[in-house]
Interface confidence: low
């Protein structure tokens, strides 16, 4: 392949270079020079849940050649490069995003991050962005959706009119119910008995730590929280844990109940201002053996 001067001729090449300043290719924002810009807003924050996947975006604006961008995590006054972590580029019409992937988010991912770009031997650093990670107990032990669906639990959904009194009333009713039907226990079919025992045993074997999660969006607090770019909203999750009564013997009647744990938003108390709590749901199972 012929070189550029050979194709253009020396005179034509001169005019190309002469015209370059008048072309708008150096401009990124009108009169501003075409420097790389990293659009992470100062004081930006993300509240995320441990166990979830998360993508941390570094919006990058460049003109011709895409710069080499890296992520680092702040540790005191130094920023430790995250070279072994999965990253990717997302290209859009006017801006590109250099993404740091969390698959999934771990509790120790809590902290401040910064992206930096090498551009024409200059190092350009972004503002830092902070991840607030809310830890969820036994996030790795959650049953799959299929597993949850296959469990033949009879759930009586009770209106959340008052947590503890309702629970006590439910337990009392169940106790009376069990007492009333104690004489008729032998009349239960083998199949039903086996099925319910199986559920009870399955629950015990897993220490009954099943969790379901639901997403809800919470508005940013009215103090000066930045970007929350994007952002401007963060995801808060509520975990529900299923418990069995550990004091019951294997083949005795038992109660399994579920209660919702409302997760408190992490270290930044400012974020909790506009959170509306969802009603607590209680479900009970009358287990007969």
């Amino acid at each position: 392949m012929k070189t550029l001067p050979a194709m253009l001729g020396t005179g034509k090449l001169f005019w190309v270079f002469f015209l370059i300043p008048y072309l708008d290719i150096w401009n990124i924002h009108g009169k501003e020079s075409c420097d790389v810009q990293l659009y992470i807003k100062r004081q930006s924050e993300h509240s995320i849940l441990a166990g979830d996947p998360f993508e941390l975006e570094c919006p990058v604006k460049y003109c011709a050649n895409r710069p080499h961008v890296t992520w680092c995590k702040l540790n005191g006054t130094t920023c430790v490069k995250l070279e072994d972590r999965q990253t990717s580029w997302k290209e859009e019409k006017n801006i590109s995003f250099f993404i740091l992937h969390f698959e999934p988010v771990l509790p120790n991912d809590n902290g401040s991050y910064r992206c930096s770009a090498n551009f024409q031997s200059n190092l350009i650093e972004s503002h830092s962005t902070t991840l607030y990670v809310t830890d969820v107990k036994s996030a790795s032990e959650r049953p799959s959706k299929d597993e949850m669906a296959s469990r033949p639990w009879l759930l009586y959904r009770l209106l959340p009119l008052g947590g503890l009194p309702l629970l006590i009333t439910t337990c009392f009713c169940l106790f009376c119910c069990l007492r009333r039907h104690q004489g008729k226990q032998n009349e239960l079919s083998d199949t039903a008995g086996r099925e319910i025992n199986l559920v009870d045993a399955h629950l015990k074997s897993e220490q009954t730590e099943a969790s379901t999660r639901q997403n809800s969006q919470v508005l940013l607090s009215e103090t000066g929280i930045y970007d929350n770019d994007p952002d401007l909203c963060f995801r808060m999750q509520e975990g529900s844990e299923v418990y069995s009564n550990p004091c019951l013997e294997e083949n005795k009647p038992g109660i399994v109940y579920a209660s919702l744990n409302h997760s408190v938003i992490g270290p930044n108390s400012r974020l909790a201002r506009n959170v509306k709590e969802a009603p607590t749901e209680y479900a009970s199972i009358c287990v007969r053996s």
């Epitope: 810009q37 019409k93 350009i124 503002h127 000066g224």
Partner: antibody
Framework: EVQLQESGPSLVKPSQTLSLTCSVT????????WNWIRKFPGNKLEYMGY???????YYNPSLKSRISITRDTSKNQYYLQLNSVTTEDTATYYC??????????????WGQGTSVTVSS | DVQITQSPSYLAASPGETISINCRAS??????LAWYQEKPGKTNKLLIY???TLQSGIPSRFSGSGSGTDFTLTISSLEPEDFAMYYC?????????FGGGTKLEIK
Amino acid sequence: EVQLQESGPSLVKPSQTLSLTCSVTGDSITSGYWNWIRKFPGNKLEYMGYLSYSGSTYYNPSLKSRISITRDTSKNQYYLQLNSVTTEDTATYYCARYFYGSYYEAMDYWGQGTSVTVSS
Amino acid sequence: DVQITQSPSYLAASPGETISINCRASKSISKYLAWYQEKPGKTNKLLIYSGSTLQSGIPSRFSGSGSGTDFTLTISSLEPEDFAMYYCQQHNEYPWTFGGGTKLEIK
């Protein structure tokens, strides 16, 4: 050069909705933050809110129940809607770009402003 | 909200003089204060951001200083085109707030 131009009715009746458009040239509204500010008679300036490159918004709490900022990226325009206006909303309305990056952050480009009178 | 008190609200000076305009925040805003110039029929011009950084294209006779709660805009050797309205604005936390303005007039 980045230019912003406000447009909309100069007279709005009380209890009606004030609707303004900011047309942007020289930059894309899919980068940066795009703001609305107003100046009351007597020169008091009030920050109203922003629309970000991603489409997220922030509204001044004093206006939260009445304000909406939206955009049309194909036209490179963003909009202000202020519901249930009163004579207190009589002001000059400005749109401005908030530029932020590795080097600096500030509202570096403003529109000329459009004067809106709320009167019956 | 952060309250910004700007003083004086009116200032008369002659070309060649040096003047100062002050802004005080109701609480610390770190270094995040910007200064703007407003002229009739023109768009607002950013002069200073982050307390002391001169915006590109602004003459060096404009300077900003201060951090925390107290900030000053100084214009040395006033030029005829400097007579205008000046505002300060904190950009440390939302909602951003402005000073009441200073009208700089020719004496």
